[in-house]
């Protein structure tokens, strides 16, 4: 996706008084514009000139789209869902042709009663949303339907939905075993044929923040990783501060390259710094002036 890159600078001042300017970047606003004039070569990494500035592609920013952002916005869905395709056989209702027609009064009445029954069955499942009848057929009434489950996105959403689908299976098995006809009559809202209960298929929302992060990081995919904060995933490079994976460059600036994160060490009026993490300071001799 294309992104508008408004670049403001944040000044970092070292204890010795030198400054490094690092851009603060917003990569969230999509744009569509066209290349103007012969400024294309000014914008690197697939970015293009819009007449005023370079429009950079994720994960790049800067005047010429030459720098790599420290974090990429990934947005997991607010909620995730599962759909279970089930079949149950209702014995307390005799199949009639009107039930084939989803707009008939008979179908609407059956749908209402069946929904009420299933709402009772699944009442203890917080993820339960409802049921949707997909087909009714002879035998007495074979009800093909979907059970819909939904939960808030968390890193453990798959486990939560998997657990909920197991409880659905347990509850539908229990009710279709207990609510059965006696002497050709049913005392419950609906009665069932115990052997007619089947789970055909289960579909769970697929969302992988790691995969989204890697895709958006493109050729830097090996260096961006996902960390969680308050159950929200963040796609970060080691140059993003405040995370477990953050690189500490001490007296330097973290910069992404195609070989990963590296520290660019600063030189002050009194010291120059070296080492992989810019933590080795060497004091300059007093008679030497640094320009």
């Amino acid at each position: 996706p294309l992104a508008t890159i408004p670049v403001s600078t944040t000044s970092l001042t070292s204890s010795e008084g030198s400054t490094i300017s690092t851009p603060s970047v917003d990569i969230s606003t999509p744009v569509t514009t066209s290349i103007v004039g012969d400024q294309c070569s000014r914008c690197k990494n697939g970015g293009f000139w819009d007449g005023l500035k370079c429009q950079c592609l994720t994960p790049y920013y800067g005047e010429s789209c030459e720098e790599v952002v420290n974090s990429i916005d990934i947005a997991p869905p607010e909620t995730v869902s599962a759909q279970m395709e089930l079949t149950v056989t209702v014995t307390s209702v005799k199949f009639t042709d009107e039930l084939k027609n989803h707009s008939s009064q008979e179908f609407r009445e059956f749908n209402k009663t069946f929904t009420e029954q299933m709402n009772i069955v699944y009442s203890g499942i917080p993820e339960y949303v409802g049921v949707n009848i997909t087909n009714l057929r002879l035998g007495s009434v074979v009800v093909e339907h979907d059970v819909l489950l939904r939960t808030k996105y968390t890193p453990e959403y798959k486990t939560a939905l998997d657990n909920a689908t197991e409880v659905v299976k347990q509850k539908i098995t229990k009710v279709t075993t207990e609510q059965i006809m006696t002497n050709d009559n049913c005392s419950a809202l609906m009665c069932f044929n115990t052997t007619g209960t089947q789970v055909q298929n289960i579909t769970v929302t697929q969302y992988d923040p790691v995969e989204e992060c890697r895709q958006k990081a493109e050729e830097y995919e090996d260096y961006f990783l996902v960390e969680y904060r308050d159950q929200k995933p963040y796609c970060i490079s080691p140059c993003e501060s405040g995370f477990n994976a953050s690189k500490n460059c001490n007296h330097g600036k973290c910069q992404m390259s195609q070989n990963g994160a590296r520290c660019l060490c600063v030189t002050t009026e009194t010291h120059w710094y070296s080492g992989e993490d810019c933590n080795q300071g060497t004091q300059k001799s007093h008679h030497h002036h640094h320009h």
Epitope: T91, S92, V93, K94, T96, E98, Q105, E106, E109, F110, K112, T113, E116, M181, D184, N185, C186, S187, A188, L189, M190, C191
Partner: nanobody, 123 residues
Framework: DVQLVESGGGLVQPGGSLRLSCAAS????????MAWFRQAPGKEREGVAF???????SYAESVKGRFTISRDNALSSLYLQMNSLRAEDTAMYYC?????????????????WGQGTQVTVSS
């Protein structure tokens, strides 16, 4: 809109008879299930007698052999002939209907209801 109106209730001596009627308007009388339920003071509503579109009938154990349910599709009416009435038959009697061919005695399965007619069996 379906409307069910009961009539025929009243005060009768033990051993006596009554015939309850239910006039159904807006209900396709040749389809579904029609039923009589009753509710005595302080008790749950219970199913008394049921009749399906094909004439299949069923009765609560307590009324078998004494009560007879029937329906006249031409007149869109439901009837309950009650013989050998007992004090324990005293209750408000309700006509109920469903468009579905039901085999359940559970009141919650019936979406259409009348206002009821009072039957009192007392000497």
């Amino acid at each position: 809109d379906v409307q069910l109106v009961e009539s025929g209730g009243g005060l009768v001596q033990p051993g006596g008879s009554l015939r309850l009627s239910c006039a159904a308007s807006g209900f396709p009388s040749s389809r579904g299930t029609m039923a009589w339920f009753r509710q005595a003071p302080g008790k749950e509503r219970e199913g008394v007698a049921f009749i399906n579109s094909d004439g299949r009938t069923s009765y609560a154990e307590s009324v078998k052999g004494r009560f007879t349910i029937s329906r006249d599709n031409a007149l869109s009416s439901l009837y309950l002939q009650m013989n050998s009435l007992r004090a324990e038959d005293t209750a408000m009697y309700y006509c109920a209907a469903s468009l579905l061919y039901l085999m359940t005695v559970n009141a919650a399965a019936y979406p259409y209801w009348g206002q009821g007619t009072q039957v009192t069996v007392s000497s």
